[in-house]
């Protein structure tokens, strides 16, 4: 039985040409996870695997950085980086948790970081 | 079509060295992490060495550890697999195999095999 | 001799339902995911079941796998003849450090 929560960072606003952390924090579960996949709507940006540690896909390289934690750094941030992210924890025995987070890149410097909420 | 392709393999004497490698495409390459799997004529599936997505972290099994290396090159689409100090043990088929995205969940695609034979 | 220990053979009718065990230890199965392939005469191994249980596309849903604690097993509902495969389990070993398989089950249609 899947017990766990996932805490992300919500809804979250940026400036353009800044730089933004993405977090998910899995809790309530004694699930080991085994690897974190972080994604842009069907996309692959990072892996963090408890064995092999972090891979940030070719494409998201030069702007996509590892941690702090789990998390994923995105910089230089573009109009074009507004959208969903999901952070997919695989657990064992529990199996998969999602989180989501929706960041919107902002061309001004009004961003501000929206309140943290829950996904079960 | 996703595709894993072996090549190198022949016959070596006990000693002799030899170099496999396995040409993938249709997919990106780099997202994944590779083995290396054997099987000896008339037996079963051995795990020989497995690489991460930028070749900084590498497990191989006791059987082969110090006389073969697992490499990579992502600009090329290929992995390799450097056979020194070969045995007739070594005599078998050799399979490149991608794992799912999740490492841990298994081999998902594999190559036709290229058959090495050690002897005199 | 493997770290996963499978049956050496396992055989039945068409239409019949077969289960094919893999036992491990406390390293491997209990903690980790199992995976199950099929190996045609003169072929390269296909994944069957990932994840113990679940089916990538393409795979009949007469394959089904499952886990309870150190042992995991492959059952084979309304057999065909062209099941007659070798079947191997595999699993990462966290001590180990290592994949490791099963010595393999040769199926037989009779």
């Known amino acids: 039985m899947m017990t766990g929560t996932i805490e992300t960072t919500g809804n979250i606003s940026a400036e353009k040409g800044g730089s933004i952390i993405l977090q998910c924090h899995l809790s309530s579960t004694t699930a080991q996870v085994t690897q974190v996949n972080w994604e842009q709507q069907d996309q692959l940006l990072a892996i963090c695997n408890a064995d092999l540690g972090w891979h940030i896909s070719p494409s998201f390289k030069d702007r996509v950085a590892p941690g702090p934690g789990l998390g994923l750094t995105l910089q230089s941030l573009t109009v074009n980086d507004t959208g969903e992210y999901f952070c997919i924890y695989h657990t064992y025995p529990d199996g998969t948790y999602t989180g989501r987070i929706f960041l919107e890149v902002l061309e001004s410097s009004v961003a501000e970081h929206g309140a943290r909420f829950q996904i079960p | 079509e996703v595709q894993l392709l072996e090549s190198g393999g022949g016959l070596v004497q006990p000693g002799g060295s030899l170099r496999l490698s396995c040409a993938a495409s249709?997919?990106?390459?780099?997202?994944?992490?590779m083995s290396w799997v054997r099987q000896a004529p008339g037996k079963g599936l051995e795990w020989v060495s497995l690489?991460?997505?930028?070749?900084?972290?590498?497990y191989y099994a006791d059987s082969v550890k110090g006389r073969f290396t697992i490499s990579r090159d992502n600009s090329k689409n290929t992995l390799y697999l450097q056979m020194n100090s070969l045995r007739a043990e070594d005599t078998a088929v050799y399979y490149c195999?991608?794992?799912?995205?999740?490492?841990?969940?298994?081999?998902?695609?594999w190559g036709q095999g290229t058959t090495v034979t050690v002897s005199s | 001799q493997s770290v996963l220990t499978q049956p050496l053979s396992a055989s039945g009718t068409p239409g019949q339902r077969v289960t094919i065990s893999c036992s491990g230890v406390?390293?491997?199965?209990?903690?980790?995911?199992v995976s199950w392939y099929q190996q045609l005469p003169g072929t390269a191994p296909k994944l069957l079941i990932y994840?113990?249980?679940q089916r990538p596309s393409g795979v009949p849903d007469r394959f089904s796998g499952s886990k309870s604690g150190t042992s995991a097993s492959l059952a084979i509902s309304g057999l065909q003849s062209e099941d007659e495969a070798d079947y191997y389990c595999?699993?990462?070993?966290?001590?180990?450090?290592?994949?490791?398989f099963g010595g393999g089950t040769k199926l037989t249609v009779l």
């Open positions: 406390s390293s491997n199965i209990e903690i980790k995911y």
């Open positions: 994840n113990s249980h």
């Open positions: 249709g997919f990106t390459f780099d997202d994944y992490v």
């Open positions: 690489i991460n997505w930028n070749g900084d972290k590498t």
């Open positions: 195999a991608r794992h799912w995205i999740v490492l841990q969940y298994g081999l998902d695609v």
């Open positions: 595999t699993s990462w070993d966290d001590r180990l450090k290592s994949w490791v």
